[in-house]
């Protein structure tokens, strides 16, 4: 059976605050839990959602959360269902509202000595207590001429007289909180001697050097006085005008006329009415000078045919707010249709190529007019002027592939080689018209090329195959000087490629034929056993029908390769003594000997007084120091061959002889003693 471990319980809650209805279930198997509100399943929202089995409220709402909540647990396998106890919220809230006239029915019916009742429309739960204010001052119950009924939230003035005139507001507070009236009520009970507003001046915006008129009228018995002041409290009369208001005229009906308005005339004008009794009434109005700023520039726009696009015209800052309209070809755009104005936007629906051109946004107010053009291009899909053609390009020469297209705006052309985008480098160049130049055509440039021409409206592409016409060339060119080892077998290769497979043959440079022990096998010169006479100049000739022939000259030298007669040995020398590293090599041509010590070649011309290389190749180092220790390499080389051998040199301190050692005791290692 399904058992509720925790059941939801009715509770107090505050409007707009968090709350939680708990529900915890224990059952033999899995169950799913959902909530009902007045019998209907509760849908999760961001404000009210299931949190595990409980129902969480991020912000209690007195309207949406009033009712009975119930937690339901269902075992969908067995169909068993259990329901919790019902729970509801006692939601505490307070909500502001206006002060309204309850009696009489309208303000027009308020007369001196009539009863006036005002109602405070602040509501809440629990019912709040109310406090009334006139002009911000609290009204206490039981004061003369008014009564407060908290139950009906009413303030009654009986009878109402001019002394009750003022701004009436109310506040209410409860256990939940406090709220004050959202809109207050101005009670105006006329005292005939008090000045009353008949006509109040309005703010005016005028263009420079135009005229401005402020109207102002008061009434009272006896008639009230009227005075105009400018910002700096300077009175304006027809007899005494401030220096900057020379062109001001006050009419008998109270209106103030300013002619040829300048920037210094802008500001606040005050009209003051004073009755025989009562406070002065001060009415304010502002004179603004019309102004209009420049409009920001438009970026040129590119649109595609068939689409719908909008261009927003930001009106320039101005006073009064400038009106905005769009024109095309000198004609104002309508407010509906295919190309029309909507608000400040230019709308182009189902764009056609003919819509391209200059559109002008106009803005105007009293201060003047501004305009800004936007250039609209209607993009077209590129069309072919010349597609790339299958081409035969000569190796080593520049090659060109055309991709000539036209469109609006000018199309962008990219090239692909074997589906890979070609980026411009030293070998590839794409001209402005779309043509691809391959600077020096190579054999592996023979493949597929594809060009794509695009505009925002779409793209076209075409491909072409490039066949490279190979040069007749040696691959690789034979080394011009080569050595062969005397009395050994030797081969000299020569291979070439061309448009047709070339024939390759060798001949001696003097034109004499090759001896019988020398064979020419498909371009490889083969010496069975090299003799001295085989040395000399040879020519490799490659030829084919269409491309003729090419020649490569090779000078063959016969040499006895280098061998070492004497090699340096591992040597240990006492510090301050002389070290001798012997090295002798033989070969033909006679090899030269060079030494390398501690990873640098020892230049015989810069050896200094301690080192010397003998004619036979041996190296001597006098007065050896520890820093001379290291590996020394003897390098023997001639024009055909190079060989090296190395040995380490150790420099050690001379040991102090111990008494037990005899004078003839040998050192513990091989030693050169000098």
């Amino acid at each position: 059976a399904i058992v509720f471990i925790k059941q939801p319980s009715s509770q107090d809650a505050l409007q707009g605050r968090r709350a939680l209805l708990r529900c915890e279930v224990e059952a033999p198997g899995p169950v799913h839990v959902y909530w009902l509100l007045d019998g209907a399943p509760v849908q999760d929202t961001e404000r009210r959602f299931a949190q595990g089995s409980s129902l969480s409220f991020a912000a209690v709402d007195r309207l949406q959360d009033s009712g009975t909540f119930q937690c339901v647990a269902r075992d969908d396998v067995t169909g068993e269902e259990a329901r919790s106890a019902n729970a509801s919220f006692n939601i505490k809230w307070i909500e502001a509202g206006p002060v309204v006239l309850k009696h009489p029915a309208s303000e027009a019916e308020i007369q001196p000595q009539t009863q006036v009742t005002l109602r405070c429309h602040i509501d809440g739960h629990p019912r709040p207590t109310y406090q009334w204010f006139r002009d911000g001052t609290p009204l206490s119950d039981g004061q003369s001429n008014h009564t407060v009924s908290s139950k009906e939230r009413n303030l009654t003035l009986r009878p109402a007289g001019p002394e009750h005139s003022g701004l009436y507001s109310c506040c209410a507070h409860s256990a939940f909180g406090q709220a004050c009236s959202s809109q207050n009520f101005t009670l105006s009970i006329a005292d005939e001697s008090f000045a009353r507003v008949v006509l109040a001046p309005q703010d005016v915006v005028v263009a420079r050097y135009e005229e401005a008129m402020f109207h102002c009228q008061f009434s009272a018995q006896p008639p009230p006085s009227l005075q105009w002041l400018f910002e700096d409290e300077t009175p304006i009369t027809n007899r005494s005008r401030p220096p900057h208001l020379r062109r001001a005229t006050v009419f008998a009906n109270g209106s103030l006329l300013l002619t040829q308005v300048r920037p210094r005339n802008a500001g606040i004008y005050r009209c003051i009415g004073q009755g025989q009794r009562g406070p002065p009434i001060i009415l304010e109005a502002t004179l603004h000078l019309a102004e209009i700023e420049d409009m920001p520039l438009f970026e040129p726009r590119v649109f595609t045919a068939g689409s719908e696009e909008r261009v927003t015209c930001l009106p320039p800052k101005g006073l009064p707010e400038p009106s905005v309209w769009w024109e095309h070809a000198g004609v104002r755009l309508p407010t509906h249709g295919r190309v029309y104005q909507k608000g400040h936007e230019l709308v182009l629906a189902n764009i056609a190529e003919s819509d391209a051109g200059v559109y002008t946004c106009h803005a105007a107010n009293l201060a003047g007019q501004r305009r800004q053009d936007v250039n609209i291009t209607v993009a077209t899909v590129p069309s072919w002027l010349k597609k790339p053609q299958d081409s035969q390009l000569e190796e080593g020469k520049p090659g060109y592939l055309d991709c000539l297209t036209q469109a609006t705006p000018k199309p962008t052309v990219v090239w692909y080689r074997n589906q890979m985008l070609i980026s411009e480098d030293s070998r590839f160049e794409v001209f402005k018209n779309g043509t691809l130049r391959i600077n020096s055509v190579e054999v592996y440039d023979g493949t597929w090329y594809r060009c794509m021409s695009s505009t925002p409206a779409g793209s076209i592409e075409a491909q072409a195959r490039v066949q490279v016409l190979e040069k007749l060339k040696f691959t690789p060119p034979p080394q011009p000087q080569q050595c062969m080892e005397f009395d050994k077998e030797a081969t000299v290769p020569c291979s070439a490629t061309g448009r047709e497979k070339p024939t390759i043959k060798w001949e001696r440079a003097d034109g004499s034929s090759l001896p019988e022990w020398v064979t020419d096998n498909a371009g490889t010169l083969h010496f069975a056993r090299v003799t001295r006479d085989d040395a000399g100049n040879y020519t490799c000739i490659a030829s084919n029908g269409p491309q003729g022939q090419i020649r490569a000259h090779v000078q063959l030298t016969v040499a006895v390769f280098i061998t070492f007669k004497v090699e340096p040995e591992r040597t240990t020398v006492y510090q301050g003594h002389t070290a001798l590293l012997q090295c002798e090599a033989q070969g033909d041509p006679k090899p030269l000997i060079q030494w390398k010590g501690k990873d640098r070649i020892l230049d015989p011309t810069k050896l200094g007084p301690r080192m010397h290389i003998f004619q036979n190749g041996s190296l001597v180092i006098h007065d050896v120091a520890p820093e001379d220790s290291g590996r020394y390499t003897c390098i023997a080389g001639n024009s055909c061959n190079i060989k090296h051998t190395e040995a380490p040199l150790y420099v050690v301190d001379k040991p102090v002889p111990e008494e037990s050692e005899g004078p003839g005791s040998p050192p513990p290692y091989k030693m050169i003693q000098t």
């Epitope: 899995p30 799913h32 959902y34 019998g39 399943p41 849908q43 999760d44 339901v72 269902r74 075992d75 969908d76 396998v77 067995t78 169909g79 068993e80 269902e81 259990a82 329901r83």
Partner: antibody, heavy 112, light 110 residues
Framework: EVQLVESGGGLVQPGGSLRLSCTAS????????MNWVRQAPGKGLEWVGI???????YYASWAKGRFTISRDTSKNTVYLQMNSLRAEDTAVYFC??????WGQGTLVTVSS | EIVMTQSPSTLSASVGDRVIITCQSS????????LAWYQQKPGKAPKLLIY???NLASGVPSRFSGSGSGAEFTLTISSLQPDDFATYYC??????????FGQGTKLTVL
Amino acid sequence: EVQLVESGGGLVQPGGSLRLSCTASGFSLSNYVMNWVRQAPGKGLEWVGIIDSSGSTYYASWAKGRFTISRDTSKNTVYLQMNSLRAEDTAVYFCARGHYLWGQGTLVTVSS
Amino acid sequence: EIVMTQSPSTLSASVGDRVIITCQSSQSVYNNNLLAWYQQKPGKAPKLLIYYTSNLASGVPSRFSGSGSGAEFTLTISSLQPDDFATYYCQGGYNGNIYAFGQGTKLTVL
């Protein structure tokens, strides 16, 4: 033994009405939810609606208005009232308690 | 309207095969897990295999397993047995006490 037995199926003309019964034994309806599911010949299962332990009903959107589920706890029986029947309502109608316990089904044929 | 889509609609396999049936819902099921799988053989009432997405019903062999969350679920038969050739249905439960079945997957012998 806990079981469900449907009855009331048969032949009915288009536009006619029929009431199916599902009698439960071995348990009390007031603690369980009961589903009605139908299966047209050679077709898949189709959920019709549910009556929960409190007697509240919920329906598939296509069933609202024409089909009504009710129960009589004293008879331990759930009903499916079907009005304005159409040829496409021809099916075997099953009642089921949760996922596990199903009746044998009753065939409803709507034909003129 | 809630739509539950099973795939494939029909499936041919051999004894010993691993079989996966998927069920996709047009909206998330309640609690992201209120989904059941049934097996039905001709002329019989459906039989519960899996409930709450992955729980094996009583008496159902362990070769049947379920997984998924939200709106996408799978039924896996790890090694098909001769008795497993039947039609399989998924059923989802949704907020507001609404339920719906998939259109079914018919599993036949290859």
